[in-house]
């Protein structure tokens, strides 16, 4: 009886079990009575990452340095290529296709965490005692100046945007 | 239905070359290879080689290999066998051959090698 | 390359009997995905080559059940059930396991 179902890592086709390619080959011809599943393997340029019978590879993705990508993994036959974006700039997808400027933290907001190559800057706004009056990638809130360690007083209160202003204390007379 | 028709009989002096066709029809040329067997009057049989439709790949008989060439023209759906440098012990019927689903034989050419 | 040998080399038979022909391989035919790739077909006079068998003993559509084929690694075994006046003609046995390709030097059955 022909099978109507076959074993992991095999296909059936005209009533035959036939050996999948293995990640890194491509199918060349199916198996038949008289013969074994023929596979190739891919060329440098092109990679399969599965047990398949693709007749052709796929092309490693490009880096394409016009859209800011640069390469962070080298694909092999059995991997694709990795991109990652290059300095400044983060992937607009999963996929990351293509790169845009990380977005800096406006004033009142500071940096919960530094962008990568594949995620952008991750703001947030400054609680009380914290401040930030830069627009910036970088910074993170900064405390408002402590005057009573510096035996001043506070003449000004700090606001998310600004420090306090501290000056001299009254003086008895 | 899956046939395979052969060209026919070809009479040929010794040194000369000959290209016989294999014409496949019933089913997806490039999807099965193409062999091709030699049968001398009165004997065995003998694999020559094959040609995969698909990328124009080839497997012989080492017996074969530098007076046999395997080439397809996919557009007609036909494969060829040309055997160079003939000499008598050539003489023989050779059948295309294709097996998948089944196996299917031309009927067969006939190769007479004589001075 | 690997030698099939067959044997008898002629098999007189009477009609409704049975038949066997013997093939042997000069080595084992069982490939490294489990399969052994040996076939057996039948050759009627002025005709091309009809296949019967392959793996062994699976047999081609439209083949009749009077043919089964048994054996394994270097011994193998073709039986007709009981011979018609059609089953008359050469038979030849086949591996596919190792290039080249090899046959059996055939086993001509005619009726007595």
């Known amino acids: 009886e022909p099978p109507t179902a076959c074993r992991e890592k095999q296909y059936l086709i005209n009533s035959q079990c036939c050996s999948l390619c293995q990640p890194g080959q491509k199918l060349v011809s199916d198996c038949t009575e008289f013969t074994e599943t023929e596979c190739l393997p891919c060329s440098e340029s092109e990679f399969l990452d599965t047990w398949n019978r693709e007749t052709r590879c796929h092309q490693h993705k490009y880096c394409d340095p016009n859209l800011g990508l640069q390469v962070q993994q080298k694909g092999t036959s059995e991997t694709d290529t990795i991109c990652t974006c290059e300095e400044g700039l983060h992937c607009t997808s999963e996929s990351c296709e293509s790169c845009v400027p990380h977005r800096s933290c406006l004033p009142g907001f500071g940096v919960k965490q530094i962008a990568t190559g594949v995620s952008d800057t991750i703001c947030e706004p400054c609680p009380v005692g914290f401040f930030s009056n830069v627009s910036s990638a970088f910074e993170k809130c900064r405390p408002w100046t402590s005057c009573e360690t510096k035996d001043l007083v506070v003449q000004q209160a700090g606001t998310n945007k600004t420090d306090v202003v501290c000056g001299p204390q009254d003086r008895q007379r | 239905q899956v046939q395979l028709v052969q060209s026919g009989a070809e009479v040929k002096k010794p040194g000369a070359s000959v290209k016989l066709s294999c014409k496949a029809s019933?089913?997806?040329?490039?999807?099965?290879?193409i062999y091709w067997v030699k049968q001398a009057p009165g004997q065995g049989l003998e694999w020559i080689g094959g040609?995969?439709?698909?990328?124009?790949?080839?497997n012989f008989n080492e017996k074969f290999k530098s007076r046999a060439t395997l080439t397809v023209d996919t557009s007609i759906s036909t494969a060829y066998m040309e055997l160079s440098r003939l000499r008598s012990e050539d003489t023989a019927v050779y059948y295309c051959?294709?097996?998948?689903?089944?196996?299917?034989w031309g009927q067969g050419t006939t190769l007479t090698v004589s001075s | 390359d690997v030698v099939m040998t067959q044997s008898p080399l002629s098999l007189p038979v009477t009609l409704g009997q049975p038949a066997s022909i013997s093939c042997r391989s000069s080595?084992?035919?069982?490939?490294?995905?489990?399969?052994?790739?040996l076939h057996w077909y039948q050759q009627r006079p002025g005709q091309s080559p009809n296949h019967l068998i392959y793996?062994?003993?699976n047999r081609f559509s439209g083949v009749p059940d009077r043919f089964s084929g048994s054996g394994s690694g270097t011994d193998f075994t073709l039986k007709i059930s009981r011979v018609e006046a059609e089953d008359v003609g050469v038979y030849f046995c086949?591996?596919?396991?190792?290039?080249?390709?090899?046959f059996g030097g055939g086993t001509k059955v005619e009726i007595k």
């Open positions: 793996q062994v003993s």
């Open positions: 086949s591996q596919t396991t190792h290039v080249p390709w090899t």
């Open positions: 040609i995969n439709p698909r990328n124009g790949g080839t």
């Open positions: 080595q084992s035919l069982l490939h490294s995905n489990g399969n052994t790739y």
């Open positions: 019933g089913y997806t040329f490039i999807s099965y290879y």
């Open positions: 051959t294709r097996h998948g689903n089944g196996v299917y």
